[in-house]
């Protein structure tokens, strides 16, 4: 039994780090493998993560952590019974993938403005809470070419756009994702999308 693709890990900078790897053949990850992780810190203990299958030869493990700070470093040991398959380390602050924003809502009752709001996925005491910026994706269900991205570079989890920038009388969907420049993170997953029917009063034309 050998590791084909070494574990790579990302942290949500809150309570979970996710490690993925591939074995050289079909593997029952949860029965055959264990990923041990230990914070490099005085009097810490090793903790065990039981991996799940992620495709035939792929494994994924969700490492539970109390919290994360920038100084943290973890040792990782991948075991198959008594055999050490791989040894490595992981610094969560250098491999951050933020949590996806939630509760995306489209408010259509603000005159002819669309107000999109969503929730910051972090509690106020988390470092990332005040460091997230967002990308909002809006697309038409009827027209695949009608696809746009709005970059929200301010901290407030909201976006206002004129309803008239979208076509009237058709349905749109929106989703949002987050990233943090301070830790050069990857983008989060997209939030679940939300749907609304776009309609607005055409301005009265004088001839």
């Amino acid at each position: 039994m050998k590791v084909l693709q070494e574990p790579t890990c990302v942290s949500d900078y809150m309570s979970i780090s996710t490690c993925e790897w591939k074995m050289n053949g079909p593997t029952n990850c949860s029965t055959e493998l264990r990923l041990l992780y230990q914070l490099v810190f005085l009097l810490s203990e090793a903790h065990t993560c039981i991996p799940e299958n992620n495709g035939g030869a792929g494994c994924v493990c969700h490492l539970l952590m109390d919290d994360v700070v920038s100084a943290d470093n973890y040792t990782l040991d991948l075991w198959a019974g008594q055999q050490l398959l791989w040894k490595g380390s992981f610094k969560p602050s250098e491999h951050v993938k933020p949590r996806a924003p939630g509760n995306l809502t489209v408010h259509t009752n603000v005159s002819d403005t669309l107000l999109l709001t969503w929730s910051n996925p972090y509690p106020p005491d988390n470092y990332l809470y005040n460091h997230l910026t967002y990308a909002v994706n809006i697309w038409s269900e009827n027209d695949p070419a009608d696809f746009r991205i709005y970059n929200v570079t301010y901290l407030e989890p909201s976006l206002r756009i004129a309803a008239s920038t979208l076509k009237s009388g058709i349905s749109y969907r929106a989703r949002v994702r987050a990233w943090a420049q301070c830790y050069n993170t990857t983008w989060s997953e997209w939030s679940p999308s939300t749907k609304w029917h776009n309609s607005y009063r055409e301005p009265f034309e004088q001839h």
Partner: antibody, heavy 125, light 112 residues
Amino acid sequence: EVQLVESGGGLEQPGGSLRLSCAGSGFTFRDFAMTWVRQAPGKGLEWVSSISGSGGNIYYADSVKGRFTISRDNSKNTLYLQMNSLRAEDTAVYYCAKDRLSVTVRPRYYGLDVWGQGTTVTVSS
Amino acid sequence: DIVMTQSPLSLPVTPGEPASISCRSSQSLLYSIGKNYVDWYLQKSGQSPQLLIYEGNKRASGVPDRFSGSGSGTDFTLKISRVEAEDVGFYYCMQSLTSPYTFGQGTKLEIK
């Protein structure tokens, strides 16, 4: 009441051995790291050794490395310090202390918040 | 090893007056925001040490609020707002960030 009680001190000749014990009560012993600290007559405090809750992580002061062994029996809620090749400079009062909560991924530190009454070790010919 | 240096080594104080003890470490004891791994202990004559302050500024359970800790990085201070007769003894700072744990030399607080 959270309590630590040391025993096993005494008079021993240079080169001899002693085994100190520290019995814990009033807290979940296995969840906490434990530490030994000593104090030579008229001197300040000196850290000796520490052990994590499971016993899997151990540290020693250079002055005792290779001579002293820290261990624990969580089923008996007891911490030990096996002292071999004793020297005159090991003469001191030895204290055990409750250290950080080490079962969490990040050990949670609240200081050495409980100390035993101390046991005296005298090394002399 | 991290060296902990206390001053003064002797501190005569009048009851009711404030007192301050300084502790300087040879390396930063700041691990993360607000977490400095430095403690303060008091050892009264003939007794075991007792914890006063941990993580630089957190008062241990049962410690009177006249005791406070401050500082970050390498410079730390223990303050007693109004010294009482029962506060006499030796005060020690200790770092617990890395092995070996190291103590300051101790400050003897006595009543004038």
